[in-house]
């Protein structure tokens, strides 16, 4: 019986050229983590297995760093990064938990927006 | 090097039974998946069975669940696949295959040959 | 199961000539999608892994692209040790599915 459960960042914003910590963590539950795969939409981010230590997607080398603990720094964001980030924490016995996390990146700051829309 | 060696191959009759083994060498066995995947005379790849590198879990094809068992000794570096009730479907070349972070098949073992015939 | 549909299951094609074969998954499988090259008597050898990984010691002029369930690998200019049959295989879920193969045979 699976008993734990994902806790994540939830909804988080973040603005474009920055960075971002994506962490999850499972809880009430003794199950052994053997993995957690790091996944954006349909795309394969980044692994991080007990044994073998992480494997970040060739593809997103220049922008993904491993950790802090089993979470993923995304660098240098983009618009095009918006949208939805899941961990899936593969667990023995239990099997596998999947947390879900919402990352929308902003055009730039709340000031320069306003900028934008001062009458002339 | 990585290197991974199949045997115990050969000719056995319907009903019967085999063990296959496979001698890995050049990694650190226990912390890699391991995979046997065989293919029938003449045509595609089947999965077959998966082992987690603690051994505590295992995974099986369901043509084949019940009848083999996969097993392996992290102290040999060896992983195993019993085969029993052996039947003319099952004859195919057998190859065991490492796989990290058991998402891709990296290394794969040169295959032994299983025929199931009376 | 996740059932792996690869086309075409055979073609004809000239050294330099530009390949392209598909894998379609019955549903979806993010990208965890690998292509394996073999050739007669010899074990499969791992070419993309995830989709688009290039596995290393492999060459350049192989590419994987797609996610979800469409998945595309391409051979830039066909070499004459490319002439082999090509799988593609999901790691998805259990059990592990690959498609039938694509023959590459020399015009």
């Known amino acids: 019986m699976m008993t734990g459960t994902i806790e994540t960042t939830g909804n988080i914003s973040a603005e474009k050229g920055g960075s971002i910590i994506l962490q999850c963590h499972l809880s009430s539950t003794t199950a052994q983590v053997t993995q957690v795969n790091w996944e954006q939409q349909d795309q394969l981010l980044a692994i991080c297995n007990a044994d073998l230590g992480w494997h970040i997607s060739p593809s997103f080398k220049d922008r993904v760093a491993p950790g802090p603990g089993l979470g993923l720094t995304l660098q240098s964001l983009t618009v095009n990064d918006t949208g939805e980030y899941f961990c899936i924490y593969h667990t023995y016995p239990d099997g596998t938990y999947t947390g879900r996390i919402f990352l929308e990146v902003l055009e730039s700051s709340v000031a320069e927006h306003g900028a934008r829309f001062q009458i002339p | 090097e990585v290197q991974l060696l199949e045997s115990g191959g050969g000719l056995v009759q319907p009903g019967g039974s085999l063990r296959l083994s496979c001698a890995a060498s050049?990694?650190?066995?226990?912390?890699?998946?391991m995979h046997w995947v065989r293919q029938a005379p003449g045509k595609g790849l089947e999965w077959v069975s998966a082992?987690?590198?603690?051994?505590?879990?295992?995974y099986y094809a369901d043509s084949v669940k019940g009848r083999f068992t996969i097993s392996r000794d992290n102290s040999k570096n060896t992983l195993y696949l019993q085969m029993n009730s052996l039947r003319a479907e099952d004859t195919a070349v057998y190859y065991c295959?490492?796989?990290?972070?058991?998402?891709?098949?990296?290394?794969w073992g040169q295959g032994t040959l299983v025929t199931v015939s009376s | 199961d996740i059932q792996m549909t690869q086309s075409p299951s055979s073609l004809s094609a000239s050294v330099g000539d530009r390949v392209t074969i598909t894998c379609r998954a019955s549903?979806?499988?993010?990208?965890?999608l690998n292509w394996y090259q073999q050739k007669p008597g010899k074990a499969p050898k791992l070419l993309i892994y995830a989709a688009s990984s290039l596995q290393s010691g492999v060459p350049s002029r192989f590419s994987g692209s797609g996610s979800g369930t469409d998945f595309t690998l391409t051979i830039s200019s066909l070499q004459p040790e490319d002439f082999a049959t090509y799988y593609c295989q999901q790691s998805y879920s259990t059990p592990l599915t690959f498609g039938g193969g694509t023959k590459v045979e020399i015009k």
């Open positions: 549903q979806s499988i993010s990208s965890y």
């Open positions: 050049g990694f650190t066995f226990s912390s890699y998946s």
């Open positions: 082992i987690s590198g603690s051994g505590g879990s295992t």
């Open positions: 295959a490492r796989v990290p972070y058991s998402v891709w098949m990296d290394y």
